[in-house]
């Protein structure tokens, strides 16, 4: 049996005060994407994509967090305290649900570096 | 130690029901996978059901599709226990049940009845169902 895997952005640094796009991708595997849930480390739910309703961005981020792009999640206006664990999660069809982790590191240095690479976690 | 104790199997006629249990003990819903499989006599164990419990208390059921529409996955952290609602018993749903459950926070993919895969098991209850 063929099951999918999870792409992720691995682990990430922004600057302060920044942006970031957190994504995951979802591939080799035929299974229908019903949900997409982005999840922050302190078990908040940032945002949730429903393939019938779209996008819910909770009330708690909804200035600082922009769907996007694709089922990915930018996360704007960056403080320290972003610095932690972001889990994707998708739920599917038959396949069930997969799960992928991101690693952001908030920097307070001008020069931090936005590096991005994407790894099977 | 993690342990996982299945409970309310029995012997049921065709269309009746019957509600499994699967408490465990020294074990934390945070970010992981639970389901059921089944085996019959002579058969290879096949998934049932799973639920993904995600940090923020948010579940996720997937079903094989021989159950869907008649089994329900369900979780009550407060009582610790995963639950197997059994509707419509067919005889062909007579098997050895089993719970599994992954480590917390580990990431497996998929959380599907598909995957075979799970770190702890349970010992099973036997479910038999006459026409």
């Known amino acids: 049996m063929m099951t999918g895997t999870i792409e992720t952005t691995g682990n990430i640094s922004a600057k302060k005060g920044g942006s970031v796009i957190l994504q995951c991708h979802l591939s080799s595997t035929m299974a229908q994407v019903t949900q997409v849930n982005w999840e922050q480390h302190d078990h908040s739910l940032l945002a949730i994509r429903n393939a019938e309703l779209g996008w819910h961005i909770y009330p708690a981020f909804k200035d600082r967090v922009a769907p996007g792009p694709g089922l990915g999640l930018t996360l704007q206006s960056l403080t320290m305290n972003d610095t932690g664990e972001y889990f994707c999660t998708y739920h599917t069809y038959p396949d069930g649900t997969y799960r992928g982790r991101i690693f952001l590191e908030v920097l307070e240095s001008s020069v931090a570096e936005h590096s991005a690479r994407f790894q099977i976690p | 130690e993690v342990q996982l104790a299945e409970s309310g199997g029995g012997s049921v006629q065709a269309g009746g029901s019957l509600r499994l249990s699967c408490t465990t003990s020294g074990y934390t819903y945070s970010r992981n996978c639970m389901g059921w499989f089944r085996q019959a006599p002579g058969k290879e164990r096949e998934g049932v059901a799973t639920?993904?419990?995600?940090?923020?208390?948010?579940?996720?059921?997937t079903y094989a599709d021989s159950v869907k529409g008649r089994f329900t996955i369900s979780l009550d952290k407060a009582k610790n226990t995963v639950y197997l609602q059994m509707n419509s018993l067919k005889p062909e749903d007579t098997a050895m049940y089993y719970c599994?459950?992954?480590?917390?926070?580990?990431?497996?993919?998929?959380?599907?009845?598909?995957?075979?895969?799970?770190?702890?098991w349970g010992q099973g209850t036997q479910v038999t169902v006459s026409s």
């Open positions: 599994a459950a992954d480590p917390p926070d580990r990431i497996s993919n998929p959380c599907g009845p598909r995957r075979p895969d799970f770190g702890y």
């Open positions: 639920i993904y419990v995600s940090a923020a208390s948010t579940s996720f059921a």
